[in-house]
């Protein structure tokens, strides 16, 4: 970054000299570079109690450059600032500070949070989720026939993931028990799954399926064929009122 760093030669006249090293145009024994060759930046470097002039191809960290008509000059940023646009506006803070509106802060103001990657104060972003998608068909072991009680699921998408201090996302999956009018599986619907189920013995300690509340059971009573559509609509309304019984995904 600071490729050309001009310094004075030894055994040089203490006053202004033209026989300078590197990027210096003029220099002195005591002060180092006094002016620089074209396009180089002049900066004052503190060495002990003394300030020495140096000529650089660009301003070092903690300085900003101004291209005046007669000199390109490096000026120090504020103490807590690593890169700045000018004295008033920092663009990157030193380690341990967070940038907010051109200033370097120990802590981010209320309503903002620290982004430890960019080291800037950013707005807190809360989770946003879509509306629920419709409930899936009522199924049991992946099938929609040959049973009375099963489960149905619905999902929603995360539209906006939260930032570190943002509100967490609510569940994006919901499952609940459902009841259907028992119907026999048609040929081919039973398939492999049906045969496997017959052979499989229940696991030790496997609990019986929970029974939905009486309202759910009422709506599942077998009814004449012609009333099936109305009954299905009623059943949906009742089930939508029920609280979900299990939650499978939380973000």
């Amino acid at each position: 970054q600071n490729a050309s760093r001009g310094r004075r030669q030894r055994r040089m006249h203490p006053n202004v000299s033209q026989g300078c090293q590197g990027g210096c145009a003029t220099c002195s024994d005591y002060n180092g570079c006094l002016s620089c060759k074209p396009r180089l930046f002049f900066a004052l470097e503190r060495i002990g109690m003394k300030q020495i002039g140096v000529c650089l191809s660009s301003c070092p960290s903690g300085y900003y450059g101004t291209r005046y008509p007669d000199i390109n000059k490096c000026t120090k940023c504020k103490a807590d600032c690593d890169t700045c646009f000018n004295k008033n506006f920092c663009t990157k803070c030193k380690s341990g500070f967070y940038l907010h509106l051109g200033k370097c802060l120990d802590n981010c103001p209320e309503g903002l949070e620290a982004n430890n990657h960019t080291m800037e104060c950013v707005s807190i972003v809360h989770c946003e989720v879509s509306e629920w998608n419709p409930w899936s068909p009522c199924t049991k072991k992946g099938k929609t026939c040959g049973f009375k009680r099963g489960t149905e699921t619905r999902v929603r998408e995360i539209i906006q993931h939260p930032s570190a201090k943002g509100n967490l996302c609510p569940p994006t999956n919901e499952t609940r028990k459902c009841t259907v009018q028992r119907k026999k599986c048609q040929k081919g619907e039973r398939g492999k799954k049906g045969r496997e189920r017959k052979r499989k013995k229940p696991n030790k300690g496997e609990s019986k399926e929970a029974i939905p509340d009486s309202k759910s059971l009422e709506s599942s009573k077998e009814i004449p064929e012609q009333r099936e559509n109305k009954q299905q609509q009623k059943k949906r309304k009742v089930q939508d009122k029920q609280k979900s019984v299990s939650v499978s995904t939380v973000h």
Epitope: Y64, Y68, D70, F85, N86, K87, F89
Partner: antibody, heavy 116, light 107 residues
Framework: EVQLVESGGGVVQPGRSLRLSCAAS????????MAWVRQAPGKGLEWVAT????????YFGDSVRGRFTVSRDNSKNTLYLQMNSLRAEDTAVYYC?????????WGQGTMVTVSS | DIQMTQSPSSLSASVGDRVTITCLVS??????FVWYQQKPGKAPKLLIY???RLQDGVPSRFSGSGSGTDFTLTISSLQPEDFATYFC?????????FGQGTKLEIK
């Protein structure tokens, strides 16, 4: 609160002189390069002159070089613009501003009208 | 001197509109670029510095982008108080130069 207050504007005949002043407060005046920027009626912004923080160097726009001089008194937090050989085209609102690459602080401006 | 070409010179828009003002610079200036807002009878006010960074107190509906020679000021949803004149300025080197200005008017 940063404040820059210009004064000294008015109506002046072509060829005459005028001196503008700018009183600064609310920031460390001696740390800043200070500038004058002008705006002719209904026109854009034009940089006029800048004097560096310690008063040791000054720079001027082509249209005023040789006619205008800029100075400052850091003990009084005051910036000056001496305008000589004024022309009709110097008619403008003159703003005093802290110049550090961008023009960060501005005064409310003072109107200079050059007319016979 | 570095030349600044700002467009459009004037623009009519309605509250809620998204507006864009552009500034083309005659040479590469990296991100040494500034936008100002000026209301009638008032001094200009610095809006954006270093091409994209908002000055304290400037609403987030304002944004700046660009680097090199092409720069843009965008107002995402115009508010009544945004009707003003906007100027760009290069801060890369002396002499500092400004764009001609864009007057944003109510449609």
């Amino acid at each position: 609160e940063v404040q820059l207050v210009e004064s000294g504007g008015g109506v002046v005949q072509p060829g005459r002189s005028l001196r503008l002043s700018c009183a600064a407060s609310g920031f460390t005046f001696s740390d800043y390069d200070m500038a004058w920027v002008r705006q002719a009626p209904g026109k854009g912004l034009e940089w006029v002159a800048t004097i560096i923080y310690d008063g040791s160097r000054a720079y001027f726009g082509d249209s005023v070089r040789g006619r205008f001089t800029v100075s400052r008194d850091n003990s009084k937090n005051t910036l000056y613009l001496q305008m000589n050989s004024l022309r009709a085209e110097d008619t403008a609102v003159y703003y005093c501003t802290a110049h550090d690459r961008s023009f960060d602080y501005w005064g409310q401006g003072t109107m200079v009208t050059v007319s016979s | 001197d570095i030349q600044m070409t700002q467009s459009p010179s004037s623009l009519s828009a309605s509250v809620g509109d998204r507006v864009t003002i552009t500034c083309l610079v005659s040479e590469d200036i990296s991100n040494d670029f500034v936008w100002y807002q000026q209301k009638p009878g008032k001094a200009p006010k610095l809006l954006i510095y270093a091409a994209s960074r908002l000055q304290d107190g400037v609403p987030s509906r304002f944004s700046g982008s660009g680097s090199g020679t092409d720069f843009t000021l965008t107002i995402s949803s115009l508010q009544p108080e945004d009707f003003a004149t906007y100027f760009c300025q290069q801060s890369y080197k002396y002499p500092p130069t400004f764009g001609q200005g864009t007057k944003l008017e109510i449609k």
